[in-house]
Amino acid sequence: HTAAQDNCTCPTNKMTVCSPDGPGGRCQCRALGSGMAVDCSTLTSKCLLLKARMSAPKNARTLVRPSEHALVDNDGLYDPDCDPEGRFKARQCNQTSVCWCVNSVGVRRTDKGDLSLRCDEVVRTHHILIELRHRPTDRAFNHSDLDSELRRLFQERYKLHPSFLSAVHYEEPTIQIELRQNASQKGLRDVDIADAAYYFERDIKGESLFMGRRGLDVQVRGEPLHVERTLIYYLDEKPPQFSMKRLTAG
């Protein structure tokens, strides 16, 4: 696994411990919590990051209307079970044997049950809608400039292939970023939209996961973009399975 050889650190994940005892005596970085080796040349999976976090010493409407099946992460933090590749296991349980099924971003998509609950597969989240509200500015951002800056950010900082950022919508003061990625579209080395969205969310909150970097500093034509509020909707390839109709506002 790639890591900064000179001082054995992980540029893409500060929630790691690195030591020079990897294959070939190279630097190896392990995620806190799980101990799994991570590839420091790309983003770490959200599951491993959540596990590490839990273990750490914590006019014309242009905006998209979230689907009735869109999920919001209302459950907050939990200590997840990750598979050998660092992805969320389909079934998650807490210490009191309460279990539920999750999607590929680790958000609950069924009612909670007991240990007998079956989750046959990890249902893929193929569409993520990130809704931001920016601080008031003297004048609205130019939509085209904003679009370009956010696309550059996701490509350069999060290494997300440009084709997976499908649209940027803007209706002052609300910005919506749409990420779309089907399982068939995602190549072996492609960053998952779930991971890119999670890194972005942590950046926006001033909790950057990148080693030695301050929070996000996005500027549109020299004007800083200050985010006041974030809401993220997750749309799965299959509808969620809740017994009662739920409100999805977060």
Partner: antibody, heavy 115, light 107 residues
Framework: QVQLQQPGSELVRPGASVKLSCKAS????????MHWVKQRHGQGLEWIGN????????NYDEKFKSKGTLTVDTSSSTAYMHLSSLTSEDSAVYYC????????WGQGTTLTVSS | DILLTQSPAILSVSPGERVSFSCRAS??????IHWFQQRTNGSPRLLIK???ESISGIPSRFSGSGSGTDFTLSINSVESEDIADYYC?????????FGSGTKLEIK
């Protein structure tokens, strides 16, 4: 050369506690994980847990979470394992070993819990 | 937790023979497996790391292979000093685990 030095033996009473030591030399102590391994007489090897001296991060096997506590003193390059509420089941050889590949081992401390 | 299953429990061979030890992991662990020799009353000694990487000071008759879930330690010409217990250990994720060991006996 890398060395991990452990006391040869410890004799303690049931119910008491003990603090086993492992003094490291010959490498940068804060750059490598230190692990502890238990071996009862005639039995196999069991991983107890590890500690990263550079940050104090610890991990334990579930079985040993209420039994052992790992600490380090970076000024003396020494790792410690505190074992509490000792019973005869805790009588064993305890090894400290370095890095994720366990490339260097101490000689082991034979802990005898007996009245 | 990752379970490592070693087989057989005991191997009995004649000097000069080739011998192979098996270690099977309960899930894919890539090449994060290491092999140890433990002679009577001694500390374990690292023989092979990351499935196939040789260790300085270890005789060249020891070699390792495998990836994923199935791993093998081989001694291409057994000597009497090789009488010992042999353990595999995974460092893929915490908690680290050991196999139950294989005892090598000389006929």
């Amino acid at each position: 050369q890398v060395q991990l030095q452990q006391p040869g033996s410890e004799l303690v009473r049931p119910g008491a506690s003990v603090k086993l030591s492992c003094k490291a030399s010959g490498y940068t102590f804060t750059s490598y994980w230190m692990h502890w391994v238990k071996q009862r007489h005639g039995q196999g090897l069991e991983w107890i847990g590890n500690i990263y001296p550079g940050g104090g991060y610890t991990n334990y096997d579930e079985k040993f979470k209420s039994k052992g506590t790992l600490t380090v003193d970076t000024s003396s390059s020494t790792a410690y394992m505190h074992l509490s509420s000792l019973t005869s089941e805790d009588s064993a050889v305890y090894y400290c070993t370095r890095s994720s590949v366990f490339d260097y081992w101490g000689q082991g401390t034979t802990l005898t819990v007996s009245s | 937790d990752i379970l490592l299953t070693q087989s057989p429990a005991i191997l009995s061979v004649s000097p000069g023979e080739r011998v192979s030890f098996s270690c099977r992991a309960s899930q894919n662990i890539g090449t994060s497996i290491h092999w140890f020799q433990q002679r009577t009353n001694g500390s374990p000694r690292l023989l092979i790391k990351y499935a196939s990487e040789s260790i300085s000071g270890i005789p060249s008759r020891f070699s390792g292979s495998g990836s994923g879930t199935d791993f093998t330690l081989s001694i291409n010409s057994v000597e009497s000093e090789d009488i010992a217990d042999y353990y595999c250990q995974q460092s893929n994720s915490w908690p680290f685990t050991f196999g139950s060991g294989t005892k090598l006996e000389i006929k």
